[in-house]
């Protein structure tokens, strides 16, 4: 058993299952029209 | 089946803790996805609080990082939200979900807190 | 944070009619990796858990009737009830699956004209 309160995750989606979104680190910001 | 069931004390004083757990049947919280918190005011919309994943890594909204603390206990399969600090704002229903890659597909029913003194 | 706005916020129609709602980020959520849009709706009905309609702008979820479609790419979303069920008055939801912190539209409460 684990009792835990994890660490920070910077990680972007791996697996199918892993629950991630996408979160690029490239993406800009740009105004919706 | 997968199902989730929020449970907590209803009623919390300002200032205080508000501390609530997500037991999760159906499914194993290390086998995968994500394991998120979401709060919805009275009569507004829904914000998410953050997430615990499947590894155990942790990811919270920065509005409220500097308050929040999701962890887990496998042995029970269920994991937890702490909010410290809380005032009347943070009165919500508050519900965990399971998160895929693409959205939240399974949800608890939610549970209310207030907070009051 | 991405900003996602809905409109109308509510609207009145009858059983039988087309009904569209509006979702636009301010930013596109449009995966170049994948060619996916991280765009979700959820629907909810009063003291009720969001239920999940469609992912990926446009999949339906499992046990979601046909009658409901998602459809845009990029900043401009909507989502279509093709013809209004009884059932189908509640509150619809977008949110954008792509970019923490992860948010959600404001809502739209379909109600009964």
């Known amino acids: 058993s684990e009792t835990t309160t994890g660490t920070s995750s910077n990680s972007s989606q791996s697996t199918s299952n892993s629950g991630l979104a996408p979160n690029p680190t490239n993406a800009t910001t740009k105004a919706a029209g | 089946q997968v199902q989730l069931q929020e449970s907590g004390p209803g009623l919390v004083k300002p200032s205080q803790t508000l501390s609530l757990t997500c037991t999760v049947t159906g499914y194993s919280i290390t086998s995968g996805y994500t394991w998120s918190w979401i709060r919805q005011p009275p009569g507004k919309g829904l914000e998410w609080i953050g997430y615990i994943q499947y590894t155990g890594s942790t990811r919270y909204n920065p509005s409220l990082k500097s308050r929040v603390t999701i962890s887990r206990d496998t042995s029970k399969n269920q994991f937890s939200l702490k909010l410290s600090s809380v005032t009347a704002a943070d009165t919500a229903v508050y519900y965990c979900a399971r998160g895929t890659t693409a959205s939240f597909d399974y949800w608890g029913q939610g549970t209310t807190v207030t907070v009051s003194s | 944070d991405i900003q996602m706005t809905q409109s109308p916020s509510s609207l009145s129609a009858s059983v039988g009619d087309r009904v569209t709602i509006t979702c636009r980020s301010s930013?596109?959520?449009?995966?170049?990796?994948?060619?996916?849009?991280?765009l979700t709706w959820y629907q909810q009905k009063p003291g009720k858990a969001p239920k999940l309609l469609i992912s990926?702008?446009?999949t339906l979820a499992s046990g979601v009737p046909s009658r409901f479609s998602g459809s845009g790419s990029g900043t401009d979303f909507t989502l279509t009830i093709s013809s209004l069920q009884p059932e189908d008055f509640a509150t619809y939801y977008c949110?954008?699956?792509?970019?923490?912190?992860?948010?959600f539209g404001g809502g739209t409460k379909l109600e009964i004209k």
């Open positions: 990926w702008a446009s």
């Open positions: 949110q954008q699956y792509f970019i923490y912190p992860l948010t």
């Open positions: 930013q596109s959520l449009l995966y170049s990796s994948d060619q996916k849009n991280y």
